[in-house]
Interface confidence: low
């Protein structure tokens, strides 16, 4: 108990000093990421820019719990995720054997006091194809790149076009058509396309971090999670080494 | 104003049980997270056991796992701890609490009873 509150306690030396009384603090996430099928992947969120102790987090995807993490019963995962789902490191969350139905939105939800309830949003998406890992740590070199060879392919489909313009008129039609294909797989796959029609992604429910700030009798009842969980004698939370 | 009233408590030996109840004023249950707490001598007051407003989901602290058992009459507005096979450690106040939101963490609860004495003599 006190090396939890000394945790706590620590947390809150590394925030920086603001006025009381507000809900100064604000949420960094890994954002939108990818994985690849049967992978893993860290799900990660850090609360900066308050003074607030961090009493709890809980791990959620959609509408459904998947980890909590108290400051003093310490880590408590989801029976249903408990092969896959693997606490920390530090207030994070691993994922693991990733499928296609694990895609969606996740949120990390901290409770403070006194600031109260901070929810973070993640977007997983998990892919079929090997592109993923590359996409989760190169999604800015790879579209740069990914639009850098669009324009020259554009660029050099445009000469040829102004050089044979009126001699090959249906050959150019079928190099614009397999442009056309080549440019829309390569968007399919990008770690930052939206989700294509009929894929995993679960919208019908409304998201849980909302439950914080509404307190509705729907999601009062939602977070009464205490069936569904499994305690795990993994110590107290890290409070204070999360690398968000 | 939300009152919670615990009785049931005694002296025991160890290996025998207890059944604690905790009476609330007006209909509170079907709003109200219900939660057991102890506290021992010179110890922090800790968490034994909830039961959610439905009644359905309940949840225990490692320690009484297996032992005790928490359990809600709607109709009589009362919320049982069934403990079984009583430990001398087990030895503590309990307090009976209800929360309208938060989690299972002492700080959550809203209302709090008087508490009842709990001794288990070796």
């Known amino acids: 108990m006190r090396w939890c509150l000394l945790l706590i306690w620590a947390q809150g030396l590394r925030q920086a000093p603001l006025a009381s009384g507000m809900m100064t603090g604000t949420i960094e996430t890994t954002g939108n990421i990818s994985a690849e099928k049967g992978g893993s992947i860290i799900l990660q969120c850090h609360l900066s820019s308050t003074t607030a102790q961090v009493t709890q987090v809980n791990w959620e995807q959609q509408d459904q719990l998947l980890a909590i993490c108290n400051a003093d019963l310490g880590w408590h995962i989801s029976p249903s995720f408990k092969d896959r789902v693997a606490p920390g490191p530090g207030l994070g969350l691993t994922l693991q054997s990733l499928t296609v139905n694990d895609t969606g939105e996740y949120f990390c939800i901290y409770h403070t006091y006194p600031d109260g309830t901070y929810t973070g949003r993640i977007f997983l998406e998990v892919l079929e194809s090997s592109v993923a890992e590359h996409g989760a740590r190169f999604q800015i070199p790879l579209l740069g790149a990914m639009a850098a060879t669009l324009v020259v392919i554009c660029t050099a489909v445009i000469v040829v076009v102004a050089l044979t313009r009126k001699k090959k008129a249906l050959r150019i039609h079928s190099v614009e058509g397999d442009l056309r294909r080549k440019s829309a797989g390569q968007e399919e796959w990008s770690p930052s396309a939206p989700s294509p029609p009929g894929s995993c992604v679960q919208a019908e429910a409304a998201p849980a971090g909302l439950c914080g700030e509404q307190r509705g009798e729907d999601c009062a009842e939602l977070h009464d999670y205490f069936n569904v969980l499994s305690y795990r004698s993994l110590g107290n939370c890290s409070f204070f080494t999360e690398t968000g | 104003e939300v009152q919670l009233v615990e009785s049931g408590g005694g002296l025991v030996q160890a290996g025998g049980s207890l059944r604690l109840s905790c009476a609330a004023s007006?209909?509170?249950?079907?709003?109200?997270?219900m939660g057991w707490f102890r506290q021992a001598p010179g110890k922090e007051r800790e968490f034994v056991s909830t039961?959610?407003?439905?009644?359905?989901?309940?949840y225990y602290a490692d320690s009484v796992k297996g032992r005790f058992t928490i359990s809600a009459d709607n109709a009589k507005n009362t919320v049982y701890l069934q403990m079984n096979s009583l430990k001398p450690e087990d030895t503590a106040v309990y307090y009976c609490?209800?929360?309208?939101?938060?989690?299972?963490?002492?700080?959550?609860?809203?209302?709090w009873g008087q508490g009842t004495q709990v001794t288990v003599s070796s």
């Open positions: 039961i959610s407003r439905s009644s359905t989901r309940t």
């Open positions: 609490a209800a929360r309208l939101w938060g989690t299972w963490t002492a700080g959550d609860y809203d209302y």
């Open positions: 007006g209909s509170i249950l079907s709003s109200y997270t």
